[in-house]
Amino acid sequence: MAEELNLERCDLEIQANGRDHHTADLCQEKLVLRRGQRFRLTLYFEGRGYEASVDRLTFGAVTGPDPSEEAGTKARFSLSDDVEEGSWSASVLDQQDNVLSLQLCTPANAPVGQYRLSLETSTGYQGSSFMLGHFILLFNAWCPADDVYLDSEAERREYVLTQQGFIYQGSVKFIKSVPWNFGQFEDGILDACLMLLDVNPKFLKDRSRDCSRRSSPIYVGRVVSGMVNCNDDQGVLLGRWDNNYGDGISPMAWIGSVDILRRWKEHGCQQVKYGQCWVFAAVACTVLRCLGIPTRVVTNYNSAHDQNSNLLIEYFRNEYGELESNKSEMIWNFHCWVESWMTRPDLQPGYEGWQAIDPTPQEKSEGTYCCGPVSVRAIKEGDLSTKYDASFVFAEVNADVVDWIRQSDGSVLKSINNSLVVGQKISTKSVGRDDREDITYTYKYPEGSPEEREVFTRANHLNKLAEKEETGVAMRIRVGDGMSLGNDFDVFAHIGNDTSESRECRLLLCARTVSYNGVLGPECGTEDINLTLDPYSENSIPLRILYEKYSGCLTESNLIKVRGLLVEPAANSYLLAERDLYLENPEIKIRILGEPKQNRKLVAEVSLKNPLSDSLYDCVFTVEGAGLTKEQKSVEVSDPVPAGDAVKVRVDLFPTDIGLHKLVVNFQCDKLKSVKGYRNIIIGPA
């Protein structure tokens, strides 16, 4: 009888499998695989080699704390003639003496997470078992049978593999691209993502069921949505919007997710201070990409926060057009969430593809602060019964705004306001380019189209179906040049009278600083004038906005809201126009000194010109970039930087990966906050 088969060691072929599975960056010490795809391993036996006629090899793969075959968290499978794609299977690739090369496959619907792989050998009545090692299984956008399959290689590269990108901020009329280091393959990030799954409340409540449900990107997306904020759990980020960030890091100061996730993991899953919508979205994007779900950050301009699902945001103003109070139902200048690509077997056909997931804690969904995934197509069709949270996301892009003016006698009158349309310029980074892609059309039919009316009817959006009033007088806020931080500049109320009558009016112009979520700050410019609008005439009335007025109260959003209220006493009518101005920060210049080569020191010279009338104090540059720096680096400039001159530092980089990388930079000082810059660097082989 043949002697017992004895395993000396197992080579998990980490590097080769990493290349095949697009996980090479994750595969330093661990085997990381994508589900539904073959992988290799080599068994080295002691004494004698494997003999098919006498030896039986059975593999075991388990995940989670309580593995079971019913839950799909435990599998046993034997060697077969060929691997069956889409199921747990194994076959022989090659045999040389005592060395057996095998090919294994995982199902395309296996739960993602950490697995333990074991081998049982039996020869006659003798048997032994061996631990082969651990591997991590991720979603697979390259596998047609996987729920996250994406058939474009360029899109897979962008939405799964690309570690850097842009998040769009600013205002609808001045869209600002902010570079971000997602860094989903950086050291420790995969561990943090798996830990995030393992501390989520659903896991703590029912570990076995949670691990089983990790086979679904819908489930995982919803868990991530809830875990990126810390409102109900040991989530990653604490949200704060009040401009008091002294005991943490200002949301505007972050330049990447890596630092955030590392802090969270290293401090025992304690909340990281502080996040706002784009930080929540960016961290969710990192986590989802890391787990293998194609994901992108999107920005919706003039985003509504509708709490009572009436698709209506009502503002009450006094006779001067000033808001009576800051309330929770508001229009945010912009709001960010993520979209993840997946099938929706739980929904009707046609609702697969991009799903909106919003990790910013706004409203509870099924008792938890999370939102989505909801089919973007369902939003476009006005199908508000769709899981999950369709009505909330529909409102974010479609709510109507009504302005009421409370007159001195206490009565309220509706004001006409055509300047604010909710859900505009919905933006994401283009595939493979540093440009913005407008994806508004994926959420909304063209304004005024029959399809749009049909959607509003289906969604019972009565306000949007009402005819708009026209008075023959129109007003809009226009801007001049030089709207950058440190400058004085003019804005104009442009008023047109398209009627045959003369109109006696009063114009109240006011500029106030504003946070990106719509909360108003102090006034920084006003004008109150009486004017006569001649028939068929156009008027342009300027409002001067001075640096000395806005400098002390501008938030890190760099936004100023200009409001014009045109009152016509004779007709007892009010016409309102608003515009959000984004003040451009100075440009960060980045020069690369030397030739960028892999595993060789590289120096970046980073500079910024002081645009203000006084010196800049307490200046700090912070840089990071996946493949360029092991961790974030900060360089302080202890000496003041006088007006008009540059602040300049040199930073040592150590590129580890060849190819295209982005060096992302943040600059902070006393009077300039969260100035961002980036530079593309192509690293060549050594």
Epitope: E548, G552, S607, D614, Y617, D639, V641, D645, A646, D670
Partner: antibody, heavy 114, light 112 residues
């Protein structure tokens, strides 16, 4: 017109503390830092430190740490310097200034004498 | 700290003469951005100092063109091409490149 108006002369006993003021007008107070400079009788100028009214951040010459405390009050557009544990060595004229410009206070004379 | 040393301590001149005052720093006062923030001030008896020159050689507005500054690295000079009575007083150099900022000891310009 930009002006820095300093408080009047002080005569104090050794060991005591004194707080002198510098009221700024004619410009936005939070836009510029205010420096303090010491000049002992018949001697040269010595930089004490600055206060940044924008964020209340102060930087000091190491020599004056523990001796001088710089603060500011936005509502009254006033910068203050408090000097503690006074000795005769602290007798001097103290100027507030917006350095790198021609805006200086008229000086506050401090005499420390028992 | 950067030590600023002025020479001479006292400079007697006749009206109409040229005057040169030297200022030497104990180490380079070039800022990390490449600029040198070396300034000159004039203090007349009983008055606050007046601002004359910034960034080594730039005259502040209203300063007569008989005043000129030069130098680099650690050696700097203030020149008055033709001294007038209103120029008398104590001249101070000042470095604003590195905290703590420092003044020179002063040079007294007086009539011979």
């Amino acid at each position: 017109e930009v002006q820095l108006q300093q408080s009047g002369p002080e005569l104090v006993k050794p060991g005591a503390s004194v707080k002198m003021s510098c009221r700024a007008s004619g410009y936005t107070f939070t836009t510029y830092v205010i420096h303090w400079v010491k000049q002992k009788p018949g001697q040269g100028l010595e930089w004490i430190g600055y206060i940044n009214p924008y964020n209340d951040g102060a930087r000091y010459n190491e020599k004056f740490k523990g001796k001088a405390t710089l603060t500011s009050d936005k509502s009254s557009t006033t910068a203050y310097m408090e000097l503690s544990s006074l000795t005769s060595e602290d007798s001097a004229v103290y100027y507030c200034a917006r350095l790198s410009s021609d805006y200086w206070g008229q000086g506050t004379t401090l005499t420390v004498s028992s | 700290d950067v030590l600023m040393t002025q020479n001479p301590l006292s400079l007697p001149v006749s009206l109409g003469d040229q005057a040169s005052i030297s200022c030497r720093s104990s180490r380079s006062i070039e800022h990390s951005n490449g600029n040198t923030y070396l300034e000159w001030y004039l203090q007349k008896p009983g008055q606050s100092p007046k601002f004359l020159i910034y960034k080594v050689s730039n005259r502040f507005s209203g300063v007569p063109d008989r005043f000129s500054g030069s130098g680099s690295g650690t050696d700097f000079t203030l020149r008055i091409s033709s001294v007038e009575a209103e120029d008398l007083g104590v001249y101070y150099c000042f470095q604003g490149s590195h905290v703590p900022f420092t003044f020179g000891g002063g040079t007294k310009l007086e009539i011979k």
